[in-house]
Interface confidence: low
């Protein structure tokens, strides 16, 4: 199936040019998306090209500027947030990145009624997190690991917590491991729907071992960065959840929400909090051995001023074949009765599907079914449920949006997106206004991305929000590679692959092959999305064939494939890449003497193991910021898939699955190892240990470090990295510079 044919005709060949590395590094062919910032059923905010904040009313067709670019510029604001009563806007400036999601910033409050900044009781700086209440204009913020509350922006703050301490106690914000591996947010506080209560998490990292690394900077002596970071088997953070009445915050103070007994009996995690009503909250907990999750619905007892979580409102989700959930345990979407909910979990056939839970999980009603997976529930209204899945035409790497009518019986299903722009758009997400009156569809490909606005009742397209016309015009004279998405059937396993082929691809010729791998549990690389990136350039200009393969352990094709890697990381992911390469060779157009593999992070681990597999298939390969031993990586992630590194659990496979154990096998390949020295996520330690093992084995290899760079290797390092990797591959494939 050719998804993106190149537009090359003989008459045009002279005017067409190949992609250059410079195109990629300059972001020449990047695309735009349009996500409305919904503020009601029919209104949204959007930052215009000239940086005005504009309010759009879909029904009247009117728009007006609520905040001028002049006001934004006066405090160098890079972000904004309108209070729900529309009286105030916070302006965010001095953005300073911390980890993946977290950052600190300076906040100014602008009063829209008088056109002035609020003076008096200004916010401290820098703030770690700030948000409006869902109704009115209360403010909650986190400063120096403590939570503060303001009833109005000009009021003095009320301090909710007092025990916050850097690297020790975190209130309202996650510590490193919860941010990266559990919550995937910069915040750990949640307003109730009408702003009566504020729930928050407290993380105690007092007993967690610390990772320390040098940050070289410009000073005479390097700084040492210390992060409480639990590696596999280490002591974990202790979490507690509290709720405070924001109307009378001082009276009772924060009330702790009890942990379900079956969870509290051993090490556990808090995984998410969902408000149902102002006086009902749903908490999800997870055992440290992550195959048991408990969803607990708690009610406010006004007479006691406490939160009551009856056992009858505990719902257990357990996996007998792997871990609970996909990458994370799914979160519930509550229906209008405020007790029943919709949730995605595995059905009896081992496919993730939407279920409706009214009383017990055992009595759950299955809403979707089939040999495909429901991926996300976007919105539940009185009469409709909107979700995404990869059902259409049995392509796991697609995403379409569906509507199920839940107001009628039997429920009827309609694919909203399947036939809208079928060639251009096969991978969608959506953003809904209040009550799903309207929604935006964002199509990511395989064609050029496009964002559109739709009527939530009829699904009619109202207007195009962003169609990337400039990008379309810029690509008219570019020889883009061809892309195919197909599958291999091997020993009852389906291996989907994406192949990126040079523009003048000729099946009778031989081409060098580069495998790009990620391969981590519950990931997906073979997706029907648009991209003009480094591998596009390698195909377009350098004439390489690039392939991406989703093997065992990858997502959205059922539990059999997903949980195949449970407790055995580093085995089947590698085997399946190798199997795919052998199949590609059989296709006849691959030069067997010029095959390489590269990957980043988990992909660096898989590429390293593939190079050291002893198959003789790979001439060379690159590992960027690889994991080298699961004992070096974060507890929450690692133990989910590997269990504990203890003798009575899974220590043996922890030891057997290291890159270092295969040092000897790198002797017959060209290996390029790359890592940032300030990687807070996959620590430089991983590559340091690979390098040490290779030196000890007297195996030659190439390496590059990036001083003071983290896991993303951003900025100028990106340019250097891709230039360096390009030279390495061209040398490996004997391609002239």
């Amino acid at each position: 199936i050719v998804l993106r044919p190149s537009r090359v005709h003989n008459s045009e060949e002279n005017t067409m040019r190949a992609l250059t590395l410079k195109d990629i590094l300059n972001g020449t062919f990047s695309y735009k998306t349009f996500f409305p910032n919904w503020i009601s059923g029919q209104e949204y905010l959007h930052q215009s090209a000239d940086n005005n904040i504009v309010l759009y009313n879909i029904e009247t067709g009117q728009s007006y500027t609520i905040l001028s670019n002049r006001t934004m510029k006066s405090v160098n604001a890079s972000n904004y947030g309108l209070s729900p009563d529309r009286q105030f806007v916070y302006l965010e400036s001095d953005y300073s990145k911390l980890w993946r999601y977290s950052y600190t910033a300076t906040y100014y409050i602008y009063d829209l009624s008088n056109g002035e900044f609020v003076r008096g009781n200004e916010l401290p700086r820098p703030i770690q997190y700030l948000c409006w209440s869902p109704v009115g204009s209360k403010l909650a913020y986190v400063y120096q690991n403590n939570i503060y509350l303001k009833q109005r922006p000009g009021d003095p703050p009320f301090q909710i917590t007092f025990n916050g301490r850097e690297n020790k106690i975190f209130n309202g914000i996650p510590d490193w491991v919860y941010e990266e591996e559990m919550l995937a947010t910069k915040y750990a506080l949640w307003w109730s729907p009408n702003g009566k209560f504020l729930a928050y998490a407290e993380f105690n990292d007092t007993d967690i071992p610390v990772i320390a690394y040098s940050y070289y900077g410009d000073e005479q002596y390097p700084r040492t960065i210390n992060i409480p970071y639990p590696k596999a088997g280490a002591k974990n953070p202790v979490v507690r959840i509290f709720i405070i009445d924001t109307t009378y915050p001082a009276y009772v103070g924060p009330q702790e929400v009890p942990v379900p007994a079956m969870i509290a009996s051993s090490d556990y995690y808090f995984s998410w909090l969902t408000w149902v009503t102002d006086e009902r909250v749903c908490l999800q907990w997870l055992k440290r051995v992550q195959n048991v999750s408990v969803l607990s619905i708690c009610d406010f007892r006004e007479d006691w001023q406490t939160w009551d979580c009856p056992k009858t409102q505990e719902h257990i989700e357990e996996s007998r074949t792997g871990w609970a959930g996909g990458f994370f345990v799914s979160t519930p979407v509550f229906s209008y009765d405020a007790i029943s909910y919709y949730k995605i979990f595995s059905d009896k056939d081992g496919y993730k599907h939407i279920h409706y839970i009214k009383d017990t999980v055992e009595n759950a009603i299955q809403i979707t079914s089939g040999k495909w997976e429901a991926i996300n529930i976007f919105r539940v209204t009185q009469d409709s449920l909107f979700y995404s899945s990869n059902e259409f035409e049995e392509y796991p790497g697609r995403r379409n949006i569906y509507r199920i009518s839940i107001g009628s019986y039997p429920p009827s299903k309609k694919c909203v997106t399947c036939h809208l722009r079928k060639e251009r758009c096969q991978y969608y997400t959506a953003s809904f206004s209040d009550y799903a009156k309207y929604y935006a569809l964002v199509c990511y490909g395989p064609g050029i991305p496009i964002s559109t606005l739709h009527d939530g009742r009829t699904d009619q397209e109202i207007k195009i929000l962003e169609e990337n016309k400039e990008l379309e015009n810029a690509l008219k004279n570019i020889q883009l590679p061809k892309e195919e998405i197909k599958k291999l059937e091997v020993d009852e396993i389906t291996l989907w692959y994406k192949m990126i082929l040079p523009p003048q691809f000729d099946r009778s010729k031989k081409y060098p092959l580069l495998i790009q791998v990620y391969g981590g549990p519950c990931s997906q690389s073979v997706r029907s999305v648009f991209a003009v990136n480094w591998i596009s350039y390698l195909a377009s200009k350098e004439g390489m064939v690039i392939a991406l393969v989703d093997g065992r352990g990858t997502a959205f094709q059922g539990d059999k494939l997903l949980y195949a890697v449970y407790r055995k990381l580093g085995v089947y992911e590698v085997e399946d890449q190798i199997t795919a390469v052998r199949k590609f060779i059989e296709m006849g157009f691959i030069d067997e003497k010029r095959i390489a593999i590269w990957g980043w992070s988990y992909g660096g681990y898989v590429s390293s193991l593939a190079l050291a597999s002893g198959t003789g298939l790979f001439k060379c390969g690159i590992a960027v910021a690889p994991v080298s031993s699961w004992e070096y990586y974060a507890s929450v992630y690692t133990e989910r898939f590997m269990g504990l590194p203890t003798k009575d659990d899974n220590l043996e496979h922890y030891k057997n699955s290291t890159v270092m154990a295969r040092a000897e096998y790198f002797r017959n390949v060209d290996y390029l190892l790359i890592h940032g020295t300030a990687d807070d996520n996959v620590h430089f330690q991983n590559s340091a240990q690979i390098a040490k093992a290779l030196v000890n084995a007297q195996v030659d290899f190439q390496a590059m470090w990036y001083s003071d760079q983290n896991h993303g290797l951003s900025g100028l390092s990106t340019n250097h990295l891709y230039t360096h990797m390009t030279h390495f591959l061209k040398q490996c494939f004997s391609l002239s510079d």
Epitope: Y251, G253, Q255, E302, W304
Partner: nanobody, 115 residues
Framework: QVQLQESGGGLVRVGGSLRLSCAVS????????MGWYRQAPGKRREWVAT???????NYADSVKARFTISRDNAKNTVYLQMDSLKPEDTAVYYC?????????WGQGTQVTVSS
């Protein structure tokens, strides 16, 4: 219906001490958080201190480190130990749940601090 009866007030010199009691009767559940409140002449009633069923305590900034709230669940009684009294502590003191969800307030007990 819950009945509240405050006692223990009186006239005291600056720096002196008093111990207030609040007897709770009727359909009272000891899991309620209880609080002390006060109202000075010509002013609005303000919150003073809270004690939860688990005996966690909270105090208004103006009384921190001088007043101590306690409770005896067996006797359904809440106490307020007032030390280092100041003239600005002069008020009628009341008890109620915290927040004050009981509709019927007691008569209160007068505390007067003279210099």
């Amino acid at each position: 219906q819950v009945q509240l009866q405050e006692s223990g007030g009186g006239l005291v010199r600056v720096g002196g001490s008093l111990r207030l009691s609040c007897a709770v009767s009727g359909s009272f559940d000891s899991r309620n958080s209880m609080g002390w409140y006060r109202q000075a002449p010509g002013k609005r009633r303000e919150w003073v201190a809270t004690i939860t069923s688990g005996s966690r305590t909270n105090y208004a900034d103006s009384v921190k480190a001088r007043f101590t709230i306690s409770r005896d669940n067996a006797k359904n009684t809440v106490y307020l130990q007032m030390d280092s009294l100041k003239p600005e502590d002069t008020a009628v003191y009341y008890c109620n749940a915290a927040p004050p969800i009981f509709n019927s307030w007691g008569q209160g007990t007068q505390v007067t601090v003279s210099s």
